[in-house]
């Protein structure tokens, strides 16, 4: 049993991290492998996470790692039995992919524009949520060639969308994902997109 | 300068103790991982154990395990390798190395020690 | 555990001349090989790792190849400094084991 890619490991700074690596050939994840992980300092407690398969020869851990500060290095330790098959060290504060906001909807506003508004997934006392930035995909469900990504660099996680830049008539959707600039993230995993139909009178609710 | 020099070496009967020094100077050494790696008096080397960057993991070699330990004291840039029940197997020169990565897949050594000589003998 | 075996055991070269050191791994170690030079009464010294990547400061003439079980150190046009003894080491998996090594004299 060998490790082919060793495991990249990303951190939602709250409450999760999680490692995903290659095996060289098809493995029972969960009944062959154990990763134990451990803040690197003598005598720290030792954790065991049990891994899954998300496909024939890759494997997935989600470690419950709580209340992370900067300087937080894990030991972490893939094991078969008692063969020790990966060893490394991961800082999660170094490795951080946010949590994918939330509860993407669109509300017609003023002056012919729409209100896209969603949720940081952050709580107000974490240190990712002043330090969100976004990413919004907005694209023509019928025309894969219409499409606009806006950045919101801006606090609020909100979006004006002039309802003239859009073809009238046409159904569009918008995703959105995050990233925190100071924590040199990568980005989040998409939202689910949510659906509306661009068009200019009435102005109800959507 | 990067530099790693080892003490503590000596000769010492079969069954008895010995713990080696290695201090690091001329990079942050709580920044690696840390190892011992021995050479015979055949020349072969044989690595012999492993410390994380904060001390929280080691690791050995089944023929080593129970009778070494690795530890560190990053405050004092200091390596250590306690040996007990010690073999005429044993003898040999003892470097500490440094690895370069954050993983198992970076254990080779891009800065070794000077050594220290062990000899196990009655 | 992975076995590495090294050839020849040694051999003689004069200053100028090109040599090569190949190493073979009782398994597949992908291109997690290193290479290292040892001189009379000194400590090694790391020359190339991932099998081919030159580590820092060490001369061109120097060069590593191979990957799977497969793998040589190539020395180009000799210089006098060159002769010693000359190491691989698999880096993929625990433990790390070390060829017997390669002993490199000159004519």
């Known amino acids: 049993v060998k490790v082919l890619h060793e495991p990249s490991c990303f951190s939602d700074y709250i409450s999760t991290s999680v490692c995903q690596w290659k095996m060289d050939h098809p493995t029972n994840c969960s009944a062959e492998l154990r990763l134990s992980y451990q803040l690197d300092f003598m005598g720290s407690e030792n954790h065991t996470c049990v891994p899954e398969n998300r496909e024939d020869s890759v494997c997935v851990c989600s470690m419950p790692i709580d209340d992370a500060v900067e300087a937080d290095v894990y030991q972490l330790d893939l094991w078969a039995g008692q063969q020790l098959l990966w060893s490394g060290s991961f800082q999660p504060s170094k490795h951080v992919k946010p949590r994918t906001p939330g509860n993407l909807t669109v509300y017609p506003n003023i002056s012919h524009t729409w209100l896209l508004m969603w949720t940081n997934p952050y709580p107000t006392e974490n240190h990712l949520h002043s330090e969100l930035t976004y990413m919004v995909n907005v694209s023509n469900d019928n025309d894969p060639e219409d499409f606009k990504v806006y950045n919101v660099t801006y606090m609020g996680p909100t979006l004006r969308l002039a309802a003239s830049t859009l073809k009238s008539g046409a159904s569009y959707s918008a995703r959105v994902r995050a990233w925190a600039q100071t924590y040199n993230s990568t980005w989040s995993d998409w939202s689910p997109s949510t659906t509306w139909l661009n068009y200019y009178e009435p102005w109800e609710q959507h | 300068e990067v530099k790693l020099v080892e003490s503590g070496g000596g000769l010492v009967q079969p069954g008895g103790s010995l713990k080696l020094s290695c201090v690091a100077s001329?990079?942050?050494?709580?920044?690696?991982?840390m190892h011992w790696v021995r050479q015979t008096p055949e020349k072969r080397l044989e690595w012999v154990a492993y410390?994380?960057?904060?001390?929280?993991?080691?690791y050995y070699p089944d023929t080593e395990k129970g009778r070494f330990t690795i530890s560190r004291d990053n405050a004092k840039n200091t390596l250590y390798l306690q040996m007990s029940r010690l073999k005429s197997e044993d003898t040999a020169m003892y470097y500490c190395a440094r690895s370069p990565g954050p993983s198992s897949f970076y254990w080779y050594f891009d800065v070794w020690g000077t050594g220290t000589t062990v000899t196990v003998s009655s | 555990d992975i076995q590495m075996t090294q050839s020849p055991a040694s051999l003689s070269a004069s200053v100028g001349e090109t040599v090569t050191i190949t190493c073979r791994a009782s398994e597949n170690i992908y291109s997690y090989l290193a290479w290292y030079q040892q001189k009379q009464g000194k400590s090694p010294q790391l020359l190339v790792y991932?099998?081919?990547t030159l580590a820092e400061g060490v001369p061109s003439r120097f060069s590593g190849s191979g990957s799977g079980t497969q793998f040589s150190l190539k020395i180009n046009s000799l210089q006098p400094e060159d002769f010693g003894s000359y190491y691989c080491q698999h880096h993929y998996g625990i433990p790390v084991t070390v060829g017997v090594g390669t002993k490199l004299e000159l004519k």
């Open positions: 991932n099998a081919k």
């Open positions: 001329g990079f942050t050494f709580s920044d690696y991982h």
């Open positions: 410390i994380s960057k904060g001390g929280g993991s080691t």
